[in-house]
Interface confidence: low
């Protein structure tokens, strides 16, 4: 059945970029890297320069959701992390600019960002029970939990 957010009329308006050029490391200290033009994967890196750098943009919900809603973009590109279905890899979708308004099926571009101490979770707005996750010998995907790893540490330049 269609996710709840597809059926609702919730509109998300772009607010601002809130983080630039950060790295996501999973609980095994693996960094997210580019697997190819379309997919991401995770690997233990000696040189963090090889890790994907992300920018995070914040959106505000028309129903003033208590959760902060974000879009993830690969820094210095026009590639945005896009959710598919459970256990499917997240895709890198190219768009000419950051969407000013997102609603309906386009909510697959959005994630609820939650923090618990140093752990960061990104839940799909389109699939609210699924998280961005890493999985052994697989792409970065959407998953509901173990054996996939759903918590990430954000590593930033301390500007």
């Amino acid at each position: 059945s269609a996710p709840f957010s597809f059926l609702s009329n919730v509109k998300y308006n772009f607010m601002r970029i809130i983080k630039y050029e950060f790295i996501l490391n999973d609980a095994l200290n693996q960094s997210i890297i580019r697997a190819n033009d379309q997919y991401l994967t995770a690997a233990a890196l000696h040189n963090l320069d090889e890790a994907v750098k992300f920018d995070m943009g914040a959106y505000k919900s028309s129903k003033d959701d208590a959760k902060i809603t974000v879009i993830l973009r690969i820094s210095k590109t026009q590639l945005y992390v896009t959710a598919q279905d459970e256990d499917q890899p997240v895709l890198l979708k190219e768009m000419p600019e950051i969407p000013k308004t997102i609603t309906g099926s386009e909510t697959n571009l959005l994630f609820f960002w939650e923090t618990h101490g140093t752990k960061n979770y990104f839940t799909s707005v389109a699939h609210p029970n699924l998280f961005i996750a890493t999985k052994q010998d697989y792409w970065v995907c959407l998953a509901g939990g173990p054996p996939s790893i759903t918590d990430f540490q954000i590593l930033e330049n301390q500007a």
């Epitope: 772009f14 601002r16 809130i18 943009g57 505000k60 003033d64 950051i98 000013k100």
Partner: antibody, heavy 122, light 107 residues
Framework: EIQLVQSGAEVKKPGASVKVSCKAS????????MNWVRQAPGQGLERMGW????????RYADDFKGRVTFTLDTSTSTAYMELSSLRSEDTAVYYC???????????????WGQGTTVTVSS | DIQMTQSPSSLSASVGDRVTITCRAS??????LNWYQQKPGKAPKLLIY???RLKPGVPSRFSGSGSGTDYTFTISSLQPEDIATYFC?????????FGQGTKLEIK
């Protein structure tokens, strides 16, 4: 109506600390970072740093690192700035200022508190 | 740190005059340039952000332009209530420095 209301004027001795509060209302506090800016008498504006009101992480300008701390009480939508080891040159008006909503200039400040005068004198 | 050089430091003009203030950054700031107005004893107010975008509610006689390192702030027809000090600020690189200000007075 969006408002940032700061605590009252303070007079401190050199070496002491001061803590200034900034209570926000009229918007969702955690969606907008909070800056702290100071202005010495007859001088320009000096940005001390910023706190991410969602995560609580802070960024401090080099000139203030080690002496300033930004904190939050999200339950009351209040930001705090504490400056320690005060000296006479810290005499200034201290402002809190909210990050702008709009894309493109992430470090513009669209709403400001009324300012808190801190006087450091022996 | 990026240095912001504002000129002139003070300016006297008549009501109705076109007033221009310039701000030069020590390096390219990619249009991340903001202009504030501060009246005596008051907090600064944002007028223009991202070099040329007018904050909603700000009168259209205020405008901004520029790119790279050189930026201009213009009041097309000076009004008595525009008497204030004007500051530029770069929002490109921490610590997001301000110009030293331009004090605007009425002749």
């Amino acid at each position: 109506e969006i408002q940032l209301v700061q605590s009252g004027a303070e007079v401190k001795k050199p070496g002491a600390s001061v803590k200034v509060s900034c209570k926000a209302s009229g918007y969702t506090f955690k969606y907008y970072g909070m800056n702290w800016v100071r202005q010495a008498p007859g001088q320009g504006l000096e940005r001390m740093g910023w706190i991410n009101t969602y995560t609580g992480e802070s960024r401090y300008a080099d000139d203030f690192k080690g002496r300033v701390t930004f904190t939050l009480d999200t339950s009351t939508s209040t930001a705090y700035m504490e400056l320690s080891s005060l000296r006479s040159e810290d005499t200034a008006v201290y402002y809190c200022a909210r990050d702008i909503y709009y894309f493109g200039s992430d470090y513009a400040m669209d709403y400001w508190g009324q300012g808190t005068t801190v006087t450091v004198s022996s | 740190d990026i240095q912001m050089t504002q000129s002139p430091s003070s300016l006297s003009a008549s009501v109705g005059d076109r007033v221009t203030i310039t701000c030069r950054a020590s390096q390219d700031i990619s249009n991340r340039l903001n202009w504030y107005q501060q009246k005596p004893g008051k907090a600064p107010k944002l007028l223009i952000y991202y070099a040329s975008r007018l904050k909603p509610g700000v009168p259209s006689r205020f405008s901004g332009s520029g790119s790279g390192t050189d930026y201009t702030f213009t009041i097309s027809s000076l009004q008595p209530e525009d008497i204030a000090t004007y500051f530029c600020q770069q929002g490109n690189t921490p610590p997001y420095t301000f110009g030293q200000g331009t004090k605007l007075e009425i002749k």
